[in-house]
């Protein structure tokens, strides 16, 4: 699976979209990082 910064950002955007934006405030690309995926 792709763990570049850009992949992480797009994947997170998808997760946010599917959750309706109901996630923790710190759930952002630079905090989550590639290790989360």
């Amino acid at each position: 699976s792709c763990n570049t910064a850009t992949c992480v950002t797009h994947r997170l955007a998808g997760l946010l979209s599917r959750s309706g934006g109901v996630v923790k405030d710190n759930f952002v690309p630079t905090n989550v990082g590639s290790e989360a995926f």
Epitope: T4, A5, C7, P29, T30
Partner: antibody
Framework: EVQLVQSGAEVKKPGASVKVSCKAS????????MNWVRQAPGQRLEWIGD????????TYNQKFKGRATLTVDKSASTAYMELSSLRSEDTAVYYC????????????WGQGTTVTVSS | DIQMTQSPSSVSASVGDRVTITCKAS??????VAWYQQKPGKSPKALIY???YRYSGVPSRFSGSGSGTDFTLTISSLQPEDFATYYC?????????FGGGTKVEIK
């Protein structure tokens, strides 16, 4: 409104260094990675590297490792790209770019900074 | 590094034409491809991410497809403002790399 505003054009001599700035506004600067890309006249786009503004962790294109240095000033919401040991082939337009999710999911680019290396 | 080979390097077309640009990666990049439009003297403008998803505000005449090594950008009905150079980019692995560009010119 998300904006990435870059510093002005530079003319440098071979062997010198240049530092380009990119001031971000309209979003939380530390939440999103900042990329740097360049484009020499008539050439394809070339990725230099990216930086996590939150941690300062960088990833570089090996082609530029040792010559390019990416940094941020979190308090000023500004990213910097410094390129050393300049040569004529470094003459290019340098761009900062960041993919933002909030407030608008989009891939934003700065207006570009022209760096000319000439003796 | 992954090479991204775009074709054609230029295409002459008329308003209303359907234009197809292809991009071939030298190795599997999944669906991790973006497309950009660039006009002379301007910054690149993002059109497509993840091979087939349009960014908000991008007209529906632009569509992307493909996965693995073969990708396509299609402009279904060319408009006057679409005359520009188009680049593909892979972001599946570092360093990110771009195609050589396709210039869409007025016939």
């Amino acid at each position: 409104e998300v904006q990435l505003v870059q510093s002005g054009a530079e003319v440098k001599k071979p062997g010198a260094s240049v530092k380009v700035s990119c001031k971000a506004s309209g979003y939380t600067f530390t939440d999103y990675y900042m990329n740097w890309v360049r484009q020499a006249p008539g050439q394809r786009l070339e990725w230099i590297g990216d930086i996590n503004p939150n941690s300062g962790v960088t990833t570089y294109n090996q082609k530029f490792k040792g010559r390019a240095t990416l940094t941020v000033d979190k308090s000023a919401s500004t990213a910097y790209m410094e390129l050393s040991s300049l040569r004529s082939e470094d003459t290019a337009v340098y761009y900062c770019a960041s993919i933002i999710i909030v407030p608008d999911y989009f891939d934003y680019w700065g207006q570009g900074t022209t760096v000319t290396v000439s003796s | 590094d992954i090479q991204m080979t775009q074709s054609p390097s230029s295409v002459s077309a008329s308003v209303g034409d359907r234009v197809t640009i292809t991009c071939k990666a030298s190795q599997n990049v999944g669906s991790n491809v973006a497309w950009y439009q660039q006009k002379p003297g301007k910054s690149p403008k993002a059109l497509i991410y993840s091979a087939s998803y349009r960014y908000s505000g991008v007209p529906s005449r632009f569509s992307g497809s493909g996965s693995g090594t073969d990708f396509t950008l299609t402009i279904s009905s060319l408009q006057p403002e679409d005359f520009a150079t188009y680049y593909c980019q892979q972001y599946n692995s570092y360093p990110y790399t771009f195609g050589g560009g396709t210039k869409v010119e007025i016939k």
